[in-house]
């Protein structure tokens, strides 16, 4: 696994322990919490990052209307079970034997049950809608400039192939970034949209996962973009399975500063 050879650190994941004990004395980095070896030339999977985090001390509408099946991460942080590749296991359980099924980004997609709950497969999240509201700025953002800058960010910072950034919508002050990646589209070595979205989410919160970098400075023709609130919607290849009681009881909570956790239903 590649890492900075001179000081043996992981540029793409600061939640690691690195030492020059790899083949030929090469720097090898392992994720905190799981101890799994990570590839420091690309993003670390969200599952391993969550595990590491838990182990650490503690009108004319151009905007997209999320579908009725869109999920928002309502449950917040938990200590996940990851498979040998670092992906989320389809079934997650807590210490009190409460279990639930998750999608490929680790968001619960069923009601909670007991140890008898079956999750036959890990359902892929193929469409992620990142909904941002930016702070008022002295200078207005041009849509095409904003589009180009966000695409550059996902390409350069998160190493996400440009074809997976489906669209950038802008209706001041709301910005929406659509990421799409079907199972058939994702080739070996491609960054997963779920991992890219998670790194972006942490950057937006001022909690960068990259080693030694300052906070994300995102500018559009020199004008800084500051984010006041973020909501992320996840759409799965197979719709989630929640009881009718859940679907009819409640609606959506409001989104204020950063990532509010709730399932979103219209």
């Amino acid at each position: 696994h590649t890492a900075a050879q001179d000081n043996c650190t992981c540029p793409t994941n600061k939640m690691t322990v690195c030492s020059p004990d790899g083949p030929g004395g090469r720097c090898q980095c392992r994720a905190l919490g799981s101890g799994m070896a990570v590839d420091c030339s690309t993003l670390t999977s969200k599952c391993l990052l969550l595990k590491a985090r838990m182990s650490a001390p503690k009108n004319a509408r151009t905007l997209v209307r999320p579908s009725e099946h869109a999920l928002v991460d309502n449950d917040g942080l938990y200590d996940p079970d990851c498979d040998p590749e670092g992906r989320f296991k389809a079934r997650q359980c807590n210490q009190t034997s409460v279990c639930w099924c998750v999608n490929s980004v680790g968001v619960r997609r069923t009601d909670k049950g007991d140890l008898s709950l079956r999750c036959d497969e890990l359902v892929r999240t193929h469409h992620i809608l990142i909904d941002l509201r930016h702070r008022p700025t002295a200078g207005a953002f041009n849509h095409s400039d904003l589009d180009a800058e966000l695409r550059r960010l996902f390409r350069e910072r998160y190493r996400l192939h440009p074809k997976f950034v489906a669209a950038v919508h802008y209706e001041q002050p709301t910005i929406q970034i659509e990421l799409r990646q079907n199972t058939s589209q994702k080739a070996a070595g491609d960054v997963d949209i779920g991992d890219a979205a998670y790194y972006f989410e942490r950057d937006i919160k001022g909690e960068s996962l990259f080693q030694g970098r300052g906070g994300l400075d995102l500018r559009v023709r020199g004008e800084p973009l500051q984010v006041e609130r973020t909501l992320i919607y996840y759409l799965d290849e197979i719709p989630p399975k929640f009881s009718m009681k859940r679907l009819t009881g409640g609606g959506s909570g409001g989104g204020s500063h950063h990532h509010h956790h709730h399932h979103h239903h219209h």
Epitope: P136, A138, G215, D217, R219, R221, G222, Q226
Partner: antibody
Amino acid sequence: QVQLVQSGAEVKKPGASVKVSCKASGYTFTSSDINWVRQRPGQGLEWMGWIYPRDGSKKYNEKFKGRVTMTVDTSTSTVYMELSSLRSEDTAVYYCATRFATVVSNYGLDPWGQGTLVTVSS
Amino acid sequence: EIVLTQSPATLSLSPGERATLSCSASSSVNYIYWYQRKPGQAPRLLIYDTSNLASGIPARFSGSGSGTDYTLTISSLEPEDFAVYYCQQWNSYPLTFGQGTKVEIK
């Protein structure tokens, strides 16, 4: 540490131009904009504009448009502010100041250069 | 342009006293920035985004406010705090500063 060092004092005649430099060190030069602010004798602070070294974007105060030009030399981490058609009321101390920002915060103008006194006199 | 009016123009206080400086905007702004300037020196950032203390600034300085009314408070004046203080807005161009409040020794 982050530091901005400006060129020395200048004395100019009315109608002439002045070019003040501001050399940055201690940070990634292309990562933040450089603003120019002046203070006339006995007056308050007046913002003139900024330039963003990464792509050369700039924003000028309309009051100075047509008279002010900001340029950047990334090879020497230096920004220049040129003010033309000088008049006596342009006599002031001219400051450069960098503005760091992230998606979370705008960190204001910090630090500032030591200032360059420009005297316009016939 | 947004006009920032600072009051009072001069504040005469003794060391140890509390200083309250006001900045009023001609139209609503989201954030205010505060700077300190001493004779012969460049301005120094004190507060960013209305209430956040800049690096190396003592905790006796604090900022608050919203909309059109903002305040800089120095809880207990130290001898080195006697200076001119400016507020600044970044809400719309041109960026503007207040005319300053001079805090002088009584």
